[in-house]
Each structure stands twice: as structure tokens, then as C-alpha cells.
Interface confidence: medium
């Protein structure tokens, strides 16, 4: 039709100019399209340079849309992480503040001369919660051993207690149970509670990290071509009013995001495991009850030591011999009154219940994030056609889109008519992130069973702001002792504040 050959390019000029490109490139009327590399080669309003510019622009617009969607998810996960992290840290800080406020009055110098031991215990608990690679049982055992030596010395200032005598005291301690049941109870409950809290928060961190890293995966050249065809070829071919057919858009984006969709199974597993571990936040061995009440176990332990002092001393002398008397030392420490115990079970504040119910709802909402991404982007960003099937843009002309919609994931793109996908070459970044999801899921499952799991930070971007309570940057690195080191797969995500050197192992 001779009339169509001289059709004006006014609409294309308007759209192209609105994108910020120079209008001097745009032909006044349609020209022959043999030069086109992506769009069908009919009469066109696009020069080679215009086609290239629009291809680059469509590529950038899809990447931006992807990043926007990812950012919303990342922000949600980051908010959750901050809320839970703040709550758990608040529980521990509250416990430490209560200890600092009540122990000097309750225990006098038995506390004040050992304040560092208690402060360091809380620092270790914080580090443990934050994912440092240490064994909590070993840490607690060391704490009780050191504390026993110091308190025994204080309770008997009239005795000379050299290092070898203290060594003997240490060997006797397990059988004598100088602190009563408190160390055992604290060990059992704290391990379960802390491992549940830290694995949940770390799960949120890993999820957020995966989203961030996947959002940075570049779209390939085949995807760029297909997106250009989807979004701008209709303009070039003189049908600027035609919007993409929904199934056509889905096939393009399923091809473009084939690797991302492969995250789906492990992503769901991770979120399921995270929802499941919140069961461990309640009850007498639950996170809230235990983390907020560490000080009460410590008070109980010191009370037990004071109550058992005479029996303990007699048994130590029996096992280690009579220590020499210190001629300059004062008489034995007067028996102090018992330190008053706060009720062990903290009444739940309601904060955690609210946080958990919000988290569960939000995690359920984003379970199908990766496989719903093509549909979401098509409906929200691509201005799809709502007209009848034969009036939409199908990549060649205005008309019905006939091919079937592909399945999700890389393997299902073998016959994608819109994007040439090499299903034998999965994206390595995304494979690594699938592995991170698997590792974290396994850790959450172990944590659910109450097992202490070593977290090792091998964060590849070294982020972390310092905890403010123990280590900052690499001024204080956290190492695990030889006997507890293990060859575990590193989890490449640090909790906020856990620096890269915390979590290193000693060689």
C-alpha cells in the first residue's frame, strides 16, 4: 500500500525524544528496514543507531525493574533482620544491665572483683549469637572454671593458692559441682536458645544477601535482543499503540530469568525452615526466656557456691591437700547473704510474638518470588495488552501470540521461541547462591534439633560494622580453639557487626 510507505514517524519521534535521545536521528517518514538487526525488517521509523539505542535502553530498563523488585524484598528482609536482631540483643543487654545493677549489692566483691569475667561472658554470648565460630559449651565451661578459681581465692584470702593448687581444684570441680545445677542448666538451655536465635537471624541475612547478589547478575545479550523486540520493535514498525501480548512477555522474561527461577526450590526450603525454627522461641528453653535470664542462672550459681562453701573446701582439701596459710592474708571471707534472684521465667513482652507473626506472614508472601518474577515484571512494568488476543504485539506484528508459555527454570527453556538459552551453561553466581541457601537451610534444620552449628564468616565482601561490645574491624579477631575446629563449608554471609576476622579459624 503506497500510503503506508510514506507513513509519518511522529509517534516514534515523540517516544524516542522522551527517552532523552537526539531527534536528529529519527526519520521524518518510514524507511526500508533491511538495516535492522533485532526488529523485523519491514518498513520502519528506526535507523540502526536508534535500534541500538533502544536495545540498550530496554536492557537497562529491565535491569532497573529487576533491581527495584529485589530492593523491595531486600528492604523487607533487612527490616525483619534488624527487628529480630535488636530484640535478641536487647534481651541480652537487659540481662547484663540487670546483672550490673543487682550483683554488686547482692554479692559485693565476689562480683566486683570478677566483673570482667561476667562482662566477657556476655561478650562471648554476643559473639556466639552473632555467628562467631566458637563452641558455646566450651566457652561456658571455661567461664565456670575461671570463675571458680577466682571465687575460691576470694572466699579463702587466708590461704596461699598457687597455680598448681588451682589446677587441682579445677580437676576436682566436675565431681564437686561447686555451682550446683546452674552451669548444666544454662549450658543446655543457652545452646538451644542461642542457636535458634542466631540461625534465624542469619537466615534472614543470607536470604537478603542472595537477593542482593542475584540482582547484580547481568542479563545476557540474547535476553537484551528479546527485550528490545518485546518493548520497542512495535514502535519501530509503526504500531506504537500495540502493547505486548501477555504470554509473549512471559516467555521473554522466563527466558531472561531462567537461572533466577532455579533458586525457587532452595529459596522455599530456606523460608520454610525459618518459619519452623520460630517454634523454638517459646517455652522454658525458648529464646526469650533464656537469653533474657542469663543473669539469674549466674546468681543461682554464686549462691550455690556460697551455700556449699564449707563442704566444697573440705572436699578440695581432701583431694588436693592442705594449702599453705598466707601470713599477710585476712581471715576467711564472711559468708554473704544470698543474692536475691529475679524470677527466672520472664513474662513474654508480646514483642516477639508480634515480630514472629509479621515475619511468618511476610515470608509466606515472598515464597514464590523467583518464579513469579517474570509474571510480576510483565504485569507491573511492561504495560501489557488487555485487549483481545489478536490486537497485541507478538514480536512480529499486531496479532495473536501462538506459542505456549514455557515452564520455570533453565531446563524448561530448551524450546523457548523468544530467547535462545543455553541450558548447558548455568550462571555460576546463581549456582553459588543456591548452594548458600542449601547450607543455611541445613543449619536451620540442625538448629531446630538443638544442635550447635559452627558459623564461619568467609564473607566475600567483608562488610560489617563492628559489634561495639567486643570486636571492631580486625582489632579483635575471633578464633576457634584447635580442639573444636572443624572442616565445614563456609557460609559466606556475616551477621551485621560480625567482622571478617571474627570467625576465622586457627590454622
Amino acid at each position: 500500500d503506497p500510503a503506508s510507505k510514506s507513513r509519518s514517524c511522529g509517534e516514534v519521534r515523540q517516544i524516542y525524544g522522551a527517552k532523552g535521545f537526539s531527534l536528529s536521528d529519527v526519520p521524518q517518514a518510514e524507511i526500508s528496514g533491511e538495516h535492522l538487526r533485532i526488529c523485523p525488517q519491514g518498513y520502519t521509523c528506526c535507523t540502526s543507531e536508534m535500534e541500538e539505542n533502544l536495545a540498550n535502553r530496554s536492557h537497562a530498563e529491565l535491569e532497573t525493574a529487576l533491581r527495584d523488585s529485589s530492593r523491595v524484598l531486600q528492604a523487607m528482609l533487612a527490616t525483619q533482620l534488624r527487628s529480630f536482631d535488636d530484640h535478641f540483643q536487647h534481651l541480652l543487654n537487659d540481662s547484663e544491665r540487670t546483672l550490673q545493677a543487682t550483683f554488686p549489692g547482692a554479692f559485693g566483691e565476689l562480683y566486683t572483683q570478677n566483673a570482667r569475667a561476667f562482662r566477657d561472658l556476655y561478650s562471648e554470648l554476643r559473639l556466639y549469637y552473632r555467628g562467631a565460630n566458637l563452641h558455646l559449651e566450651e566457652t561456658l565451661a571455661e567461664f565456670w572454671a575461671r570463675l571458680l578459681e577466682r571465687l575460691f581465692k576470694q572466699l579463702h584470702p587466708q590461704l596461699l593458692l598457687p597455680d598448681d593448687y588451682l589446677d587441682c581444684l579445677g580437676k576436682q570441680a566436675e565431681a564437686l559441682r561447686p555451682f550446683g545445677e546452674a552451669p548444666r542448666e544454662l549450658r543446655l538451655r543457652a545452646t538451644r536458645a542461642f542457636v535458634a536465635a542466631r540461625s534465624f537471624v542469619q537466615g534472614l541475612g543470607v536470604a537478603s544477601d542472595v537477593v542482593r547478589k542475584v540482582a547484580q547478575v547481568p542479563l545476557g545479550p540474547e535476553c537484551s535482543r528479546a527485550v528490545m523486540k518485546l518493548v520497542y520493535c512495535a514502535h519501530c514498525l509503526g504500531v506504537p499503540g500495540a502493547r505486548p501480548c501477555p504470554d509473549y512477555c512471559r516467555n521473554v522474561l522466563k527466558g531472561c530469568l531462567a537461572n533466577q527461577a532455579d533458586l525457587d526450590a532452595e529459596w522455599r526450603n530456606l523460608l520454610d525452615s525459618m518459619v519452623l525454627i520460630t517454634d523454638k522461641f517459646w517455652g522454658t528453653s525458648g529464646v526469650e526466656s533464656v537469653i533474657g535470664s542469663v543473669h539469674t542462672w549466674l546468681a543461682e550459681a554464686i549462691n550455690a557456691l556460697q551455700d556449699n562453701r564449707d563442704t566444697l573446701t573440705a572436699k578440695v582439701i581432701q583431694g588436693c591437700g592442705n594449702p599453705k596459710v598466707n601470713p599477710q592474708g585476712p581471715g576467711p571471707e564472711e559468708k554473704r547473704r544470698r543474692g536475691k534472684l529475679a524470677p527466672r521465667e520472664r513474662p513474654p513482652s508480646g514483642t516477639l510474638e508480634k515480630l514472629v507473626s509479621e515475619a511468618k506472614a511476610q515470608l509466606r508472601d515472598v515464597q514464590d518470588f523467583w518464579i513469579s518474577l517474570p509474571g510480576t515484571l510483565c504485569s507491573e512494568k511492561m504495560a501489557l495488552s488487555t485487549a483481545s488476543d489478536d490486537r497485541c504485539w507478538n514480536g512480529m506484528a499486531r496479532g495473536r501470540y501462538l506459542p505456549e508459555v514455557m515452564g520455570d527454570g533453565l531446563a524448561n527453556q530448551i524450546n523457548n521461541p523468544e530467547v535462545e538459552v543455553d541450558i548447558t551453561k548455568p550462571d555460576m553466581t546463581i549456582r553459588q547462591q543456591i548452594m548458600q541457601l542449601k547450607i543455611m537451610t541445613n543449619r536451620l534444620r540442625s538448629a531446630y534439633n538443638g544442635n550447635d552449628v559452627d558459623f564461619q564468616d568467609a564473607s566475600d565482601d567483608g562488610s560489617g560494622s563492628g559489634s561495639g561490645d567486643g570486636c571492631l574491624d580486625d582489632l579483635c579477631s575471633r578464633k576457634v580453639s584447635r580442639k573444636s575446629s572443624s572442616s565445614r563449608t563456609p557460609l559466606t554471609h556475616a551477621l551485621p557487626g560480625l567482622s571478617e576476622q571474627e570467625g576465622q579459624k586457627t590454622s
Partner: antibody, heavy 122, light 105 residues
């Protein structure tokens, strides 16, 4: 009596690495944190590095962070300081010190000092 | 860093007080004496006011809030030295020292 003997000092080349060793005796080594403290000519004391009794906690002064590594060997009762990428400002006396505490890294807890080993980076 | 006066002077028999501030409240201080540059420091007091057995009782320590004070009661000529305080940086958990106070008797 507690004794701390430092060795490994001397004239060093800028950019190279330095390894200092402190041999401890007269106390139960595995019970206490150990530190390295240095003093540049005409200057005050500066905390270089410390290590807790178990070897799990280490702390570093800001001037050496990223260049220093402290380690301990309880079997040998030694503490080692490795300082990489030496600079002229690393010149000074390096003292080994014992803490009264098992915990790293508080400079309020030092109860014994070695005689020091002189390091000259030139 | 910890803040100390650069110098103090006293006559024999007088009481001298050297202050050290800038540490984190709730953390202890130690006091160390160095008689000549390059000689090994000697611990006078550790963890606020614990005195090693060979240190004379005229050296004592106290702490109020985040300021520590070393008191030398009845100062003697042999006390002429540089005195350093030490504590811990509560954020980095690394040791810190004051710049030193020169005592002239």
C-alpha cells in the same frame, strides 16, 4: 619468679616481615593473656597486640591492624608476634607483658614485663 | 587515647596525685612506672588498686567514674620516673595507654 624473655629484634628492612618471640616461665602460661607493647624512641607505650589464654581472642592496636598476627604455643610457653610490611615508624623497643587475667586485651591487667627487644627498621 | 598531665613535680615527702581520664566507665586502669627510656616498665598497680608484692605501699590507686588517680604518699627521690596508665578501648577491645606523666622530685 615470672620471667619474660623477648628475642627476634635487630635491624630490619622496610617492607619485610618481623617475627618476635617471647619465652615465658615461672607461672602457668595457659592461664593468662599475653601482650606485646612497644615504645618508639622518645615516645610513650603503645599496645601492639594481645592474645587471651585460650588463643581464641586476639586484639590489635590500630597502628598495626592488618599487618600483625599474634599467636601462642602453650606447650612451649611462647608468644609470637609477626609484623608484616615493616615501616620506619615500627622502630622501637618491643616488650612482652603478662596479664593477671585470662581475658584479652586490657592494658590495665599487666603485672609483669619483659626487658624488651629493640627493633630498628631502616 | 587516655589523657594524663604531661608532668608533675613534688618535693620529697609530699603526696603526688597523677590522673588518667578518657577510659570507658566501668573499666579498670593500671599504672606503670618507667625510670629511663628503653628500660622495662614496672607494674605499680593493676586492675585499679591491686599492688604487686614488691611494690611499696606508698603507691595506691583509686577510680571515680572514668577517671583514675595514682597517689604516691610521701614521694621519694627514686620515684622520679615517667608514669603511664593503661586501660581498654571498649569498642575495639584493644589495650590503650596514656601518653605518660613525668614526675620530677
Amino acid at each position: 619468679a615470672v620471667t619474660l624473655d623477648e628475642s627476634g629484634g635487630g635491624l630490619q628492612t622496610p617492607g619485610r616481615a618481623l617475627s618476635l618471640v617471647c619465652k615465658a616461665s615461672g607461672f602457668t602460661f595457659s592461664r593468662y593473656a599475653m601482650y606485646w607493647v612497644r615504645q618508639a624512641p622518645g615516645k610513650g607505650l603503645e599496645f601492639v597486640a594481645g592474645i587471651g589464654n585460650t588463643g581464641r581472642y586476639t586484639g590489635y592496636g590500630s597502628a598495626v591492624k592488618g599487618r600483625a598476627t599474634i599467636s601462642r604455643d602453650s606447650g612451649q610457653s611462647t608468644v609470637r608476634l609477626q609484623l608484616n610490611n615493616l615501616r620506619a615508624e615500627d622502630t622501637g623497643n618491643y616488650y612482652c607483658a603478662k596479664s593477671v587475667s585470662p581475658y584479652c586485651c586490657d592494658a590495665a591487667d599487666i603485672d609483669a614485663w619483659g626487658h624488651g627487644t629493640e627493633v630498628i627498621v631502616s | 587515647a587516655l589523657t594524663q598531665p604531661a608532668s608533675v613535680s613534688a618535693n620529697p615527702g609530699e603526696t603526688v596525685k597523677i590522673t588518667c581520664s578518657g577510659g570507658s566507665s566501668g573499666y579498670a586502669y593500671g599504672w606503670y612506672q618507667q625510670k629511663s627510656p628503653g628500660s622495662a616498665p614496672v607494674t605499680l598497680l593493676y586492675s585499679n588498686n591491686n599492688r604487686p608484692s614488691d611494690i611499696p605501699s606508698r603507691f595506691s590507686g583509686s577510680k571515680s567514674g572514668s577517671t583514675a588517680t595514682l597517689t604516691i604518699t610521701g614521694v621519694q627521690a627514686e620515684d622520679e620516673a615517667v608514669y603511664f596508665c593503661g586501660s581498654v578501648d571498649s569498642s575495639s577491645y584493644a589495650g590503650i595507654f596514656g601518653a605518660g606523666t613525668t614526675l620530677t622530685v
